[in-house]
């Protein structure tokens, strides 16, 4: 069945049941997501506007899908498996009496079950499992997923990674020669290479050992920290910088007015909320955008996405992926892919990795 092809998932509560205080609804839904994030690498965040991956809806009767609710009792809720549009959305029957306790129907317990479906789980035949098809109240203070639930969800997403990269907590300058150093984004700018990390960037002038660290805000005061992707079109003296669902255009090292703009103007579908990495190849005049385990190819001349995308990174970039942090183009034949503290020199003509390096190998570490 389908799964989310990313680990950062957004949800939005479209409307609130009058049966409960709003804060109690927020809390029940947040705790229900937490049940699943505790046993997987998934991270959930609530958004209040815009398109979320998972929309939580309270509705009665016919409500916009084929599966009309049936009044009090019977079907309590339903949820759609991962995907765009209605995919992932969880619908709760407003004709039930939703509660924080054992009376009526407990929202938290029902939400844990429905979010299981939103993440791609089917029903379980184990009566102790939260994914068992019938509702049964259990003490929410001592609630635990069953071994079957955990096995099911970890078969889809794996277990929580202890070594997951966390953002630099105090935003202090990262140690350049730390062997675990990773970058948020990397791009060439003329004969220089910019390496972005948190609120800093390092500037490396090609073939020279010296590098300097700078605050992004010192060069471009209007830009945010935490740039996530970047690419250069050298012939136009343009650099594109990405964060979340926005991008900025830098021309001749100066930010253009009327930016940021939405990444969706490139033609990404709505479910794309951020770009992991991007690189422009002047030979083909195409930009490659990497999003989770997929990539899109954009025709810079025609200003539109090439048909047939997205494609899987692992399928078309042998040895790279499934996900990357950063990439840049150099020496007319190489992409340098960054994955955590590792870097791969990739010959795009031979279509293979030609060298494996540490991410900070450019700094003479």
């Amino acid at each position: 069945g389908p799964v989310w092809r990313k680990h950062y998932i957004t949800y939005r509560i479209n409307n609130y049941t009058p049966d409960m205080n709003r804060e109690d609804v927020d809390y029940a839904i947040r705790k229900a997501f937490q049940v699943w994030s505790n046993v997987t690498p998934l991270k959930f965040s609530k958004i209040n506007t815009g398109m979320a991956d998972i929309l939580v809806v309270f509705a009665r009767g016919a409500h916009g899908d084929f599966h009309a609710f049936d009044g009090k009792g019977g079907i309590l809720a339903h949820a759609f498996g991962p995907g765009s549009g209605i995919g992932g959305d969880a619908h709760f029957d407003e004709d039930e009496f939703w509660t924080t306790h054992s009376g009526g129907t407990n929202l938290f317990l029902t939400a844990v079950h429905e979010i299981g479906h939103s993440l791609g789980l089917g029903h379980s035949s184990d009566p102790k499992a939260v994914m068992f098809p019938t509702y049964k109240y259990v003490d929410i203070n001592t609630f635990r997923l069953s071994a079957d639930d955990i096995r099911g969800i970890q078969s889809l997403y794996g277990d929580p990674k202890e070594n997951q990269r966390l953002p630099n907590p105090d935003n202090s300058e990262p140690a350049l020669c730390d062997p675990n150093l990773s970058f948020d984004a990397v791009t060439t700018v003329g004969n220089k290479i910019f390496f972005f990390k948190d609120r800093f960037f390092w500037l490396k002038v090609s073939e020279r050992p010296k590098t300097s660290v700078n605050l992004i805000s010192s060069l471009w005061p209007t830009l945010p920290s935490g740039i996530e992707a970047a690419y250069e079109i050298e012939a136009r003296n343009q650099v594109f910088l990405f964060k979340d669902d926005k991008y900025w255009l830098i021309s001749n090292l100066r930010p253009e007015p009327n930016y940021p703009k939405s990444i969706h103007s490139f033609g990404f579908p709505n479910f794309v909320k951020k770009i992991d990495a991007a690189v422009f190849n002047p030979r083909f005049y195409r930009t490659y955008f990497f999003v989770d385990n997929q990539y899109w190819r954009y025709d810079e001349r025609r200003q539109m996405m090439d048909p047939g995308y997205p494609k899987l990174i692992t399928k078309n970039f042998q040895g790279i992926g499934p996900k990357i942090d950063a990439v840049f183009y150099s020496k007319n034949k190489y992409y340098y892919f960054f994955q955590g503290s590792n870097q791969f020199e990739y010959d795009f003509l031979l279509q293979r990795i030609t060298k494996t390096l540490k991410s900070n190998s450019w700094f003479g570490c």
Epitope: G1, L55, V57, F66, H67, F80, G81, G83, I86, N270
Partner: antibody
Framework: EVQLLESGGGLVQPGGSLRLSCAAS????????MHWVRQAPGKGLEWVSG????????FYADSVKGRFTISRDNSKNTLYLQMNSLRAEDTAVYYC???????????????WGRGTLVTVSS | DIQMTQSPSSLSASVGDRVTITCRAN??????LNWYQQKPGKAPELLIY???SLQSGVPSRFSGSGSGTDFTLTISSLQPEDFATYYC?????FGQGTKLEIK
């Protein structure tokens, strides 16, 4: 390449029966909801019926409820529509359409067949 | 029951024009609205799903917007191949269709 090919249409008298088939290829048929949508000559689109992946869950438009039966044979990658007690107003091109989802139907039809014409006339 | 009202029912326009078609639901359908294009004698084709997501392979001159009860399909610059009939749809309910003709 996804292909849906309808067959079984033709001329039938009011009160008569007809069975439409839709042969699916180019995708794994069994996990997806499938639907029939019709279009009377010169008119708009009208959803007729839908069926879940295993065939256990079916939905019908009020206009055909009790007269039409949707079914599927996953081993043959084929969708069916059995039409009984046909009326003049059932005259239409009948399209088979693939839903984008399994488990619950989203009602989002990403692939359609070319249609088969059913004419109900005496 | 949910009903969809599409307007206008027909529309004349010229190549290069910007065209907007609207669809209204009688109750909230969130963003569960799709748009299809149908050319004479052909099956419908999916253009936009979930109100604003462009189906793969559809030109970027097509865009959709809206949520709740009011939705629009916009063609930013009409091309000769865009003259067709457009339908909005939500689950088992289609709008009446908008026939887009050459002026």
């Amino acid at each position: 390449e996804v292909q849906l090919l309808e067959s079984g249409g033709g001329l039938v008298q009011p009160g008569g029966s007809l069975r439409l088939s839709c042969a699916a290829s180019g995708f794994t048929f069994s996990p997806y909801w499938m639907h029939w949508v019709r279009q009377a000559p010169g008119k708009g689109l009208e959803w007729v019926s839908g069926i879940g992946p295993s065939g256990g869950l079916t939905f019908y438009a009020d206009s055909v409820k009790g007269r039409f039966t949707i079914s599927r044979d996953n081993s043959k990658n084929t969708l069916y529509l059995q039409m009984n007690s046909l009326r003049a107003e059932d005259t239409a091109v009948y399209y088979c359409a693939k839903d984008i989802r399994g488990a619950y139907s989203s009602g989002l039809f990403d692939y359609w067949g070319r249609g088969t014409l059913v004419t109900v006339s005496s | 029951d949910i009903q969809m009202t599409q307007s206008p029912s027909s529309l004349s326009a010229s190549v290069g024009d910007r065209v907007t078609i609207t669809c209204r639901a009688n109750q909230s359908i969130y963003t569960y609205l799709n748009w299809y294009q149908q050319k004479p004698g052909k099956a419908p084709e999916l253009l936009i799903y979930a109100a604003s997501s462009l189906q793969s392979g559809v030109p970027s001159r097509f865009s959709g917007s809206g949520s709740g009860t009011d939705f629009t399909l916009t063609i930013s610059s009409l091309q000769p191949e865009d003259f067709a009939t457009y339908y909005c749809q939500q689950a088992g309910i289609f709008g009446q269709g908008t026939k887009l003709e050459i002026k």
